[in-house]
Interface confidence: low
């Protein structure tokens, strides 16, 4: 779409695939930027998709920390990187991947 | 295990709208590593995703670009369900409708089917 | 529109080997995991290989997932093909906009 992306300015989380489906990360993750982002006005609006862990990820973990990434400014933008699953819901592009 | 119950008329009229529900059991709708689709197949389309229902601190909702204008889809947390809703279906709307569930580290697991046909 | 290409149809002997094609017609196949689902006649689908190449439980190791991004495209294999895997197969990815798209589908005959 042009214009600035978050994924070129953060670096990459190698080795990691996110979660099949957009989540925002658990209440016990240490900082959720998405709670201090206001929603941009967008007809398609997306939830923040943190990273988890390869391989076997655990759905009850979705991030492997509680960690900073770009997926956590991601909060009612549309699209969003990184490859997920089978889900039918949210984001399920690889990280660093652009989409068409 | 998830299982999902559909239900809904097997018979609608050209111009009036498709109704359908999907019951969840095994799973909740308002859960936050679920997404919640409806899909049809017929001879003419293959399968065709139609959208899906999902939560994250709130709801969303997508839908395909070939239905966009007149479908809905409502989740139903009170009953755990939720629901498909087709306005204006012609002839060409007749299909075999699925509810199914996606979820984490699965590919979708699928309702069983409701034919519907759309004649007068 | 991002389109998934398979197969019509493919028809081999039991015991023999079958490989089905999806090709996506842009984009990497690689930066969406692709699901496969087995159809039988009267039923609903049922996935076979989920996330590109896993296998969920109860699927048979006969059946394998891969990818090849020199031609775009993912692959089902079915090993020491059997009467019961006579079914329709469809792939399953996503579009740019995170939608799900499904392939054409792909007939498995296994010839008697």
């Known amino acids: 779409d042009g214009g600035f992306d978050l994924s070129d300015a953060l670096p990459d989380n190698e080795n990691k695939k996110p979660t099949a489906i957009p989540k925002k990360p658990s209440a016990g993750d240490d900082f959720d930027l998405g709670d201090a982002v206001v929603d941009g006005e967008n007809d398609d609006p997306r939830p923040p998709n943190p990273p988890k862990p390869m391989p076997n990820p655990n759905p009850n973990h979705p991030s492997s920390s509680g960690s900073f990434s770009d997926a956590d400014l991601a909060d009612g933008v549309s699209g969003g990187e990184g490859k997920g699953g089978s889900d039918g819901g949210g984001s399920h592009r690889k990280e660093g991947e652009e989409a068409d | 295990q998830v299982q999902l119950q559909q239900s809904g008329p097997g018979l609608v009229k050209p111009s009036q709208t498709l109704s359908l529900t999907c019951a969840i059991s095994?799973?909740?709708?308002?859960?936050?590593?679920?997404?919640w689709n409806w899909i049809r197949q017929s001879p003419s389309r293959g399968l065709e995703w139609l959208g899906r229902?999902?939560?994250?601190?709130?709801?969303?909702?997508d839908y395909a670009v070939s239905v966009k204008s007149r479908i809905t889809i409502n989740p139903d947390t009170s009953k755990n369900q939720f629901s498909l809703q087709l306005n204006s279906v012609t002839p060409e709307d007749t299909a075999v409708y699925y509810c199914a569930r996606g979820s984490y580290g699965s590919g979708l697991v699928w309702g069983q089917g409701t034919t519907v046909t759309v004649s007068s | 529109n991002f389109m998934l290409t398979q197969p019509h149809s493919v028809s081999e002997s039991p015991g023999k080997t079958v490989t089905i094609s999806c090709t996506g017609s842009?984009?990497?196949?690689?930066?969406?995991?692709v699901q496969w689902y087995q159809q039988r006649p009267g039923s609903a689908p049922t996935t076979v290989i989920y996330?590109?190449?896993?296998?969920p439980s109860g699927v048979p190791d006969r059946f394998s997932g891969s990818l090849d991004t020199s031609s775009n495209s993912a692959s089902l294999t079915i090993s020491g093909l059997r009467p019961e895997d006579e079914a329709d197969y469809y792939c399953?990815?996503?579009?740019?906009?995170?939608?799900?798209?499904f392939g054409g589908g792909t007939k498995v005959t296994v010839l008697s």
């Open positions: 399953q990815s996503y579009d740019n906009k995170d939608n799900v798209v």
């Open positions: 095994g799973d909740s709708v308002s859960s936050n590593s679920a997404a």
């Open positions: 842009s984009g990497s196949i690689a930066s969406n995991y």
């Open positions: 996330e590109d190449d896993q296998r």
């Open positions: 229902t999902y939560y994250r601190s709130k709801w969303y909702n």
